[in-house]
Amino acid sequence: FERTRSLQDPCSNCPAGTFCDNNRNQICSPCPPNSFSSAGGQRTCDICRQCKGVFRTRKECSSTSNAECDCTPGFHCLGAGCSMCEQDCKQGQELTKKGCKDCCFGTFNDQKRGICRPWTNCSLDGKSVLVNGTKERDVVCGPSPADLSPGASSVTPPAPAREPGHSPQ
């Protein structure tokens, strides 16, 4: 069937980067500037994506592939193929309808994007709080209170990455 189709349809011979030009007896014509065709046999070329404003060009458009965008510094990509750029906040904040707001007490965000998440509830695992949480960091859970009774083997916890309560510079 494929061979039959290619014999009947001259457009199937047009490679990527060209289109089958109906106005010129179905000759394979190169894609015009700022357009591309990523597969063979196309009857039109697609318009290249333009990276405007907060979007910057990560990969230029070619005759066979679309441009790719990412976000300028201070923004990060959202959605498939970076279809949106969202403003960063600081660690310890989340982006709301009214802008970047500090995480409420009992929640934290250790990234410049995303939402504030509740601190881990150590007691649910029968553990105690070893290091208090901050707006930027989750609590660190330690051994259960029973494990800390006299005579129990001591556990040396790993040192925290930085002093709790101090924001990153």
């Epitope: 979007f55 923004f75 959202l78 970076c82 969202e86 403003q87 709301t96």
Partner: nanobody, 122 residues
Framework: QVQLVESGGGLVKPGGSLRLSCAAS????????MSWARQAPGKGFEWVSG???????YYTESVKDRFTISRDNAKNSLYLQMNSLRPEDTAVYYC????????????????WGQGTQVTVSS
């Protein structure tokens, strides 16, 4: 095609005022949310302000109570009244459509003007 043309930028002393305008064409302005962004020298973009088609307004913290966004649908125009200007407001200001309706978020289908320079210096 869609066109956004900003005007009204210039050199102003600290504490002074400027009114930026954005003339829109090529789309249904009255039903479109619009926004202002800025890019300071050597820095990234910053979302400044947005206005819904219905008139609800939003501002980034640093310009609240100093800047006022408004629109005139009859004239297909967007405005940014900037009062009590500070040196840190120095930037190129851009008018953009705001299809996401989300603070600090633009989509690839949004359109942008070429920008107008605002310099605040004594």
């Amino acid at each position: 095609q869609v066109q956004l043309v900003e005007s009204g930028g210039g050199l102003v002393k600290p504490g002074g005022s400027l009114r930026l305008s954005c003339a829109a064409s090529g789309f249904t302005f009255s039903s479109s949310a619009m926004s202002w962004a800025r890019q300071a020298p050597g820095k990234g973009f910053e979302w400044v302000s947005g206005i819904y088609s219905g008139g609800s307004t939003y501002y980034t913290e640093s310009v609240k109570d100093r800047f006022t966004i408004s629109r005139d649908n009859a004239k297909n125009s967007l405005y940014l009244q900037m009062n009590s200007l500070r040196p840190e407001d120095t930037a190129v200001y851009y008018c953009a459509t705001w299809g996401t309706l989300r603070f600090g978020v633009w989509a690839e289908y949004d359109h942008w003007g070429q920008g107008t320079q605002v310099t605040v210096s004594s």
